[in-house]
Amino acid sequence: YKLVCYYTSWSQYREGDGSCFPDALDRFLCTHIIYSFANISNDHIDTWEWNDVTLYGMLNTLKNRNPNLKTLLSVGGWNFGSQRFSKIASNTQSRRTFIKSVPPFLRTHGFDGLDLAWLYPGRRDKQHFTTLIKEMKAEFIKEAQPGKKQLLLSAALSAGKVTIDSSYDIAKISQHLDFISIMTYDFHGAWRGTTGHHSPLFRGQEDASPDRFSNTDYAVGYMLRLGAPASKLVMGIPTFGRSFTLASSETGVGAPISGPGIPGRFTKEAGTLAYYEICDFLRGATVHRILGQQVPYATKGNQWVGYDDQESVKSKVQYLKDRQLAGAMVWALDLDDFQGSFCGQDLRFPLTNAIKDALAAT
């Protein structure tokens, strides 16, 4: 099985124990590590952070001791903006320039492939996204002719039903991608006005009608029905939780909220907590399991957080094995307890390790 793990370059800027550099990563933990994110400047793939080149080197030296490890560079992301991607993909010349710039950049910096993180193509971009993928793959095949190992091509796709319908020609893009990471998280957010788990495995009794498509099982099944081969589908598992501030004494699933949860000490983003911050939060919190959805949530005071733990990730891995998927994807290594100092197990990357162990289990 593949274990595809994202590393985010901006995690270096977190304070103190939250700061994560690629040299802190475990070279034997994942089969693929994806560095997020690269930029596109003047239609050419480019660095984003001032020290990206240094960090690329740090990451790719992990392969010295583990030659089986593959590294990919992810281009795009939330801050890149869908509109910018749209302009490049929809213009034949811009698209060609971008595609041509990719292989030399990846080779220069020691990457084994490219991950496309266009978040997200609109319905008007659907055809252009397919063309971008098809042409990128053709370029990779051509570039590998002189006996080089062919560069890998993957894409991170939304698990939201409306986005899947609007953005992706699943059957066509699947033909050209080496694997597809389906982002089976962020199904539920503060915009709903109630508590809810952002990455349930199944729908569960707790979900009202609007949420019938907002679960991992549905998204995976729908992708397969739309023509994605199971052998290319990698299922996303988050090492972060989504938090809410409760608006009343109700604390269950569907309780009213006043907004996102308070920011974490290190990640500093309202409504999001890294797993290592959740481990801190759990001290003195009340933990519940949403049985139908097979995921936990915890409450403390007026704070509510839905997250994944070692038990839930094992359920998810068993599910993806039952579905005969290609493996699991983790967002993100730097949100797991990468130092092993927060979750009281003397184990670095406890969630990702639990996923790895479950994948290896017979």
Epitope: G122, R123, R124, Q127, K161, V162, T163, D165, S166, A208, S209, P210, R212, Y222, R225, L226
Partner: antibody, heavy 120, light 108 residues
Amino acid sequence: QVQLVESGGGVVQPGRSLRLSCAASGFTFSSYGMHWVRQAPGKGLEWVAVISYDGSDKDYADSVKGRFTISRDNSKNTLFLQMNSLRAEDTAVYYCARDDYDSTYYFDNWGQGTTVTVSS
Amino acid sequence: SYELTQPPSVSVSPGQTASITCSGDILADQYASWYQQKPGQSPVLVIYHDTKRPSGVPERFSGSTSGNTATLTISGTQAMDEAAYYCQAWDINTAWVFGGGTQLTVLG
């Protein structure tokens, strides 16, 4: 407010052609997908054709494929349906309808309709 | 033949709850929308994405979906609700498809 006004309907003989228009106002026409939906006398609604916001993408119901052509002129805020080789079963009220092209698959605004009668 | 099946007619007394169903395999994977059409008028969207109500549509209109069946519920039905109701969905293979329509009659 959003307004869609169809025109161009009438009585036409089988095998002949007709061109329907839909004048749009009250919204940014060039940002929306547009559809034609028809309703035969005493019958239900039948989707006919769709065109993307910029006219680059079109799709048709099997019953009209090869005979009808949907088009638009964004500079004039107008949608068209060119109907060729008309048949008796094309007799219906034809509505133009709007669709928020980025994320929706339903019709949030409809015109009042224009009647097409195909009869010898 | 319709991909979406609706009962041809439903009758209800004023003030009572009317339920109109719409069934079809595509509803397992697709959102249902509902339209109201009064005689001589064009259709009006009353429910989209299974349960969402456009602004201006009275709260007595609600939608739900379970499995392959979508339901439009009108609670406290009024005489003005007498109309034909159509369900609609989109599918990658069938594009936009409507149910055959249900005539709601408000008795009395």
